[in-house]
Structure formats: structure tokens, C-alpha cells
Interface confidence: medium
């Protein structure tokens, strides 16, 4: 469970306008539990197919987890008067497969959004920015939790999932104030090149349990506030000099690298040298080689340059296609 949110039909302003009355400040939607004292509304595991229209105006924490929302339309949480207090919205595990542009518009205080565990076949580029302008009004979001939002293979669009998520993160430069971004367990093969440049306020970035093979084209240079970078459980083979220098240059960062299949050949020499002197990597004594076979389970910190060789290229007569 986490903080949650409220939404409406695809004609959000009509809901309360129909009766020409704003919702009563203390009413509680059917199938929900409400606490005005805690400013919390919970509509959890109720198989809701849309966001209740009659959410109380006091709601600060809204939980809509474990439902069957399917689509979050534009203005899903827009109300008249607006839900001005809503700060934390949790939509995790609600079978969302489509989040449309402007879905979170008219939520001026929304600081935390959790869309985890939804198989998002479509995430609009304007889901968080709310408009297709090249520079949008800043989003109030500070924490964005997008763990395990990758759809099953048969539901994927033709475009790359990484690209779709990246487009939503950078659109309109709306997320310049984002402090925390969790993108764990999304089968990411790569991190699109310009994403991090558009998120300069990031303090916590979780990319664990993906399939990242390389960080060669990723720049961390402008993430001067970054405090924690989680890269555990990926497919990283080596970190090259450019990446090492950028990480070392970040004043507050802690990097987590456990459980990657490090390849301990001649290309690993710079990383091993760096590991021995850096204070940036947490638990660096636990990092071990996965390849080549002769190096398996060797501790990276215990290696020296003599251990890190590359097999010479086979002569043409011995090469196989």
C-alpha cells in the first residue's frame, strides 16, 4: 500500500457539475474507506473500473490499489472544485494498461505518484507534463514510483518500452523538481541517452532488477544532487572510465552494484583500480566476477592487473563463424 489518488470519467468536470453542487466535504464514495482526520481515502481491492467521482475535498492520501481501472483518461482526477490537497496517489496493482496525456492534471499538490505493478502498454508522453508544449508548467511531483510497469511481451507496442517511459519523463521538462524515481523490474535493456539530463534534481534513482548491459551512453554528470543510485540485479559487464569519472565527480552519491555479471578481463582493469580507491560504491567487497569461467566468483577488489587478461584473437585458421 502507498498513498493513492482519485480520478473520474473521461468527462471529469461533468461529474460534479451535473448536480450543480460540489461534492460534500465529508462524503465517502461507495466501496471506499475514508478518514478525514488522516486525510486519507482508501478504495482498495474493490475491482473498481474507474476512479470515483465523489472524492472528498479533504483527501491528501488516496489509495486506489488492487482495482481494474484499465485506462486512466485525461483529467482523471480533475474536479470542481479541484482536489487541491491531494499529495500522494497510489494506483499500484490496478491493472492499468493505458495512461493518457493529462491524466494527473489539476492536482496542484501531487507530490508522490505510484503506478507500480501495472502492465502499461501505453504511457502517453504527456502523462506527467499534461501538455504537448516543449516547455510545460512544472509538475509538483517529487516522488515517482514506476516499479514493474513493463507489460507482457504480447501487449507491447512496436516502439521500445524504454523509449516510451523516457518520453514521458522528459516531456516539457515538467519533472525538473523530481527527487525520487523508481524504475525497478522493468526489463530495461538500456537507459535512453537524454533522460537524466532532464531530471537535474534527482536524489534517489532506482534502476535495479532490469537488464541494463552498459552505461556507456548514459551521463550522470548533471545529477549533482544524486545521493543513491541503485543498479543491482542488472546485466552490467563493466563500467568504463567515462562513467567512473562521472560517478566519482558526484559529491553525495552512493552506488549499489551487487549481482551484476562482471566480466573480469583486460577491460575491467580501470574499474578494479577505481573500486579500490573509491568510497562511492556500497558493499564493494561483495562484487565478484561472473566471466570468464576461470575467474568466476573471484572478488573484484582482490584482483590485480596480472589477473585481468584478454585472450589473444585466434589466428584465422582456428576461427569459426
Amino acid at each position: 500500500t502507498s498513498s493513492a489518488s482519485s480520478s473520474s470519467s473521461s468527462a471529469p468536470f461533468l461529474a460534479s457539475a451535473a448536480s450543480a453542487q460540489p461534492p460534500l466535504p465529508d462524503q465517502c464514495p461507495a466501496l471506499c474507506e475514508c478518514s478525514e482526520a488522516a486525510r486519507t481515502v482508501k478504495c482498495v481491492n474493490r475491482n473498481l473500473t474507474e476512479v470515483p467521482t465523489d472524492l472528498p475535498l479533504y483527501v491528501r492520501n488516496l489509495f486506489l490499489t488492487g482495482n481494474q481501472l484499465a485506462v486512466l483518461p485525461a483529467g482523471a482526477f480533475a474536479r470542481r472544485p479541484p482536489l487541491a490537497e491531494l499529495a500522494a496517489l497510489n494506483l499500484s496493482g490496478s491493472r492499468l494498461d493505458e495512461v493518457r496525456g493529462g491524466a494527473f492534471e489539476h492536482l496542484p499538490s501531487l507530490r508522490q505518484l505510484d503506478l507500480s505493478h501495472n502492465p502499461l502498454a501505453y504511457l502517453s508522453p504527456f502523462a506527467f507534463s499534461g501538455s504537448n508544449a516543449s516547455i510545460s508548467a512544472p509538475s509538483p511531483l517529487v516522488e515517482l514510483i514506476l516499479n514493474h510497469i513493463v507489460p507482457p511481451d504480447d501487449k507491447r507496442q512496436n516502439r521500445s518500452f524504454e523509449g516510451m517511459v523516457a518520453a514521458a519523463l522528459v516531456a516539457g521538462r515538467a519533472l525538473q523538481g523530481l527527487h525520487l524515481l523508481e524504475l525497478a523490474s522493468n526489463h530495461f535493456l538500456y537507459l535512453p541517452r537524454d533522460v537524466l539530463a532532464q531530471l537535474p534534481s534527482l536524489r534517489y534513482l532506482d534502476l535495479s532488477n532490469n537488464s541494463l548491459v552498459s552505461l556507456t551512453y548514459v551521463s550522470f554528470r548533471n545529477l549533482t544532487h544524486l545521493e543513491s543510485l541503485h543498479l543491482e540485479d542488472n546485466a552490467l559487464k563493466v563500467l568504463h572510465n567515462g562513467t567512473l569519472a562521472e560517478l566519482q565527480g558526484l559529491p553525495h552519491v552512493r552506488v549499489f552494484l551487487d549481482n551484476n555479471p562482471w566480466v573480469c578481463d583486460c577491460h575491467m582493469a580501470d574499474m578494479v583500480t577505481w573500486l579500490k580507491q573509491t568510497g562511492v560504491v556500497q558493499g564493494k567487497d561483495r562484487l565478484t566476477c561472473a566471466f570468464p569461467e576461470k575467474m568466476r566468483n573471484r572478488v573484484l577488489l582482490e584482483l590485480n592487473s596480472a589477473d585481468l587478461d584478454c585472450d589473444p584473437i585466434l589466428p584465422p585458421s582456428l576461427q569459426t563463424s
Partner: antibody, heavy 121, light 107 residues
Amino acid sequence: EVQLLESGGGLVQPGGSLRLSCAASGFTFSSYAMSWVRQAPGKGLEWVSAISGSGGSTYYADSVKGRFTISRDNSKNTLYLQMNSLRAEDTAVYYCARYYGGYYSAWMDYWGQGTLVTVSS
Amino acid sequence: DIQMTQSPSSLSASVGDRVTITCRASQSISSFLNWYQQKPGKAPKLLIYAASSLQSGVPSRFSGSGSGTDFTLTISSLQPEDSATYYCQQTYGYLHTFGQGTKLEIK
């Protein structure tokens, strides 16, 4: 309904070993990080160890590092804690707990009932 | 490691009282703090997560606040069933440490 059921506790001599198990049901086990927390008699809670959903990443309190090993079998929906070189100060009730959330937005939302480990000669 | 210090270590209050327990971190932990309640012989129970979010099923008389290093758990109107030990826990650090606990007794 989420359920966590610990087993494997008992009396063991100093220097001995014990393996605790935690059988999970009612949720998709592999999607959640899990943890062990212990409580010595009359004392407070002490975080012992945690493991990621895949089992690939493990974390240990300094007091148990090198002696305890956390692991999981996602096909059996079971969490384990292998405890070696046990000491008198490891005597405690050991709880398994489920983590909800990410690395930071993380909290233990379900706990088992605990299993008592007594280390004594 | 990040140290968590709770105060007071114990307190006694009457039914209907407003009770406040504080938790201080040895370094900034943003809002990554949880509160648990434990009754004798029972497993801990999650009350508040992420500093201020109330866990499902927890009475609304419980609330949490704070950010950075200083956090507060408040019980707005103490009930007899609130007699228990309360623990804070940080999840910012690599190791998710608990405070030493605050034992709350009903007068």
C-alpha cells in the same frame, strides 16, 4: 490472505548452526523483497537481513555479516536464513517480514508470528 | 550506519490523552521512515509508512509527521488498546535500522 509462517527455531549450542524457513502464501512471492528481523528477550527489534525479489541482492546487519546467509526459493515461495557460528547474543525471536515498495519507499507490511532461537550450552 | 534514537524510552498516559513519540535520525533520511506497534508476545504491526501515510486498517487517531532527521508519531486520543511498544525504522540507509523503542503504558 497474505500469510508468513516461520519454522526451524530451537535450542543450539554456541558455534552451532540452524536454518530458519519462512513459508509465504497469498501473494506473488517473487515480486517482493523479504527480510528477517529479530528480537532478543526483553529487547527491541533488530533488522538482520534482507533479500531482493529475485534473490540476487542480499543485505546484512554488521552483527551477522559473514555468519548468516539469507536466500529464497521462489518456486517454493520460501525464505531462508542459514545461521552459522551461533553465539549466545543471537538468542532471539526471529521474524520474517515482507517488504512493500522500492528501495526507499519501503516498509514491512506483513510479518510472521516468529520462531525462537536459543543459543546456549 | 544510520542510528535512530527514540524518545522517551517509556511513558505513561491516560485514556483520551494526546501522546507524542519522537524519533531522530543521525543523518537526513528524507521521509523514508516507518512506525510499528508491538504488543507483548505478538509480531510488530505497521502503523505509518513514508513518515506520514497511515497503513490500511490502522485507526485514524494515529498520525505521523516529519522529514529529514526529526519525526513524530502522534496518538490524538489514547485508547486502552494502544498500550504497546512503538518502534521507528529508517529505510534510507543500506541497513534498515530500528529505533530502540518507546514503551507506552496506560495510567
